[in-house]
């Protein structure tokens, strides 16, 4: 099965869920997810869709700074000289270190041993002030196209 | 167990606010969407928006815009809708769901506005 | 925004019966549309994600199928308790949208 439509999708932004049928067993699902132990085919569906909403997010938040850099520059430098483009850059790599952290989280780390390196070279880089630029590279050429699309496809053979 | 739990109803008066809560619990609240879906008497379901603890994301359904405020406590895992200047057409049923699908419904708060 | 039409309103039928409700969407859906069952005076319940994918728990009666602007939920044998009102939502695009509901009466 094919991956859904990813980049026609990538327009929109999602969320939706619903209620179980009373079915026990499913009430344990989130407490043995987390803890490793189980993850039925809807969780699976879910970290596909959230990884999904996780890239185009981080794209949104690059392409806003981005234009609001090109029109309002001198706005934008702050009184510190490059708070704002700063904070930006640190919350993307907050976002992005706690998501690949989530997506390990119960798998191991020796899943993904070359994503949980580079969040966390990045996240020792962001005081060098070469975090920006590595971190745009890395979601733009790694996170977007292979992990992303690595992780999902991998998933939706997974649940067959 | 998974639960999201919501006041059982509320009486407001026309033009009045009310804030209603969706307190979640048995689960990793910062790892997933929280919807808002309201349900009129007799009538079927609208989305009104959501929320991701996580990234701070909050989405508005136009239609509900200038009516709703969502907010977010993680403290206290708790979601906020709040409905302003009350109309007789904010009478509805207000369900709190968790991501894409609504897998988990809340009990939904009863909103009547009347005077 | 993606508007969801679902046919038709209200049906009644027997139990043991087959049922096919369907929801057409204004626009591709691709296949993130869900299907939800709600009772009198209860919240709704997730049946089918994914356009059709059960979810967990859901007697496997149920079947979903469809993709882009077609989507079935089909009842292979009614049973009175599934005496309920159905929903399709699509979450492929802001803002997620609903139809109108199908009500499934027994004769």
């Known amino acids: 099965r094919s991956l859904q439509d990813t980049e026609e999708k990538s327009r929109s932004f999602s969320a939706s869920q619903a209620d179980p049928l009373s079915d026990p067993d499913q009430m344990n699902e989130d407490k043995r997810h987390s803890q490793g132990t189980f993850t039925s085919d809807y969780s699976k569906y879910l970290d596909s869709r959230r990884a999904q909403d996780f890239v185009q997010w981080l794209m949104n938040t690059k392409r806003n700074r981005n234009n609001i850099a090109k029109r309002h520059d001198e706005f934008e430098r702050h009184a510190e000289g490059t708070f704002t483009s700063d904070v930006s850059s640190y919350l993307e790599g907050q976002a992005a270190k706690e998501f690949i952290a989530w997506l390990v989280k119960g798998r191991g780390r020796r899943d993904f041993p070359e994503e949980v390196a580079i969040v966390e070279e990045l996240g020792r880089r962001h005081a060098d002030g070469s975090f920006s630029d590595e971190m745009n590279t890395i979601l733009d050429n790694l996170a977007a196209r292979d992990f992303i699309n690595w992780l999902i496809q991998t998933k939706i053979t997974d649940r067959k | 167990q998974v639960q999201l739990l919501q006041p059982g109803a509320e009486l407001v008066k026309p033009g009045a606010s009310v804030k209603l809560s969706c307190k979640a619990s048995?689960?990793?609240?910062?790892?997933?969407?929280l919807n808002w879906v309201k349900q009129r008497p007799g009538q079927g379901l609208e989305w009104i928006g959501n929320?991701?603890?996580?990234?701070?994301?909050?989405n508005y359904n136009e239609k509900f815009k200038s009516k709703v405020t969502l907010t977010v406590d993680t403290s206290s895992s708790t979601v906020y809708m709040q409905l302003s200047s009350l109309t007789s057409d904010d009478s509805a049923v207000y369900y709190c769901?968790?991501?894409?699908?609504?897998?988990?419904w809340g009990q939904g708060t009863t909103v009547t506005v009347s005077s | 925004n993606i508007v969801m039409t679902q046919s038709p309103k209200s049906m009644s039928m027997s139990v043991g019966e087959r049922v096919t409700l369907t929801c057409k969407a204004s626009?591709?859906?691709?296949?993130?549309v869900a299907w939800y069952q709600q009772k009198p005076e209860q919240s709704p319940k997730l049946l089918i994600y994914?356009?059709?994918h059960r979810y967990d728990g859901v007697p496997d009666r149920f079947t979903g199928s469809g993709s882009a602007t077609d989507f079935t939920l089909t009842i292979s044998s009614v049973q009175a308790e599934d005496l309920a009102d159905y929903y399709c939502?699509?979450?492929?695009?802001?803002?997620?949208?609903f139809g109108g509901g199908t009500k499934l009466e027994m004769k």
């Open positions: 769901a968790r991501d894409y699908d609504n897998a988990y």
């Open positions: 048995g689960y990793n609240f910062n790892d997933y969407w």
């Open positions: 929320a991701y603890p996580g990234w701070g994301i909050i």
């Open positions: 626009e591709n859906a691709g296949t993130y």
């Open positions: 994914n356009g059709s």
């Open positions: 939502g699509q979450s492929y695009s802001y803002p997620w949208t």
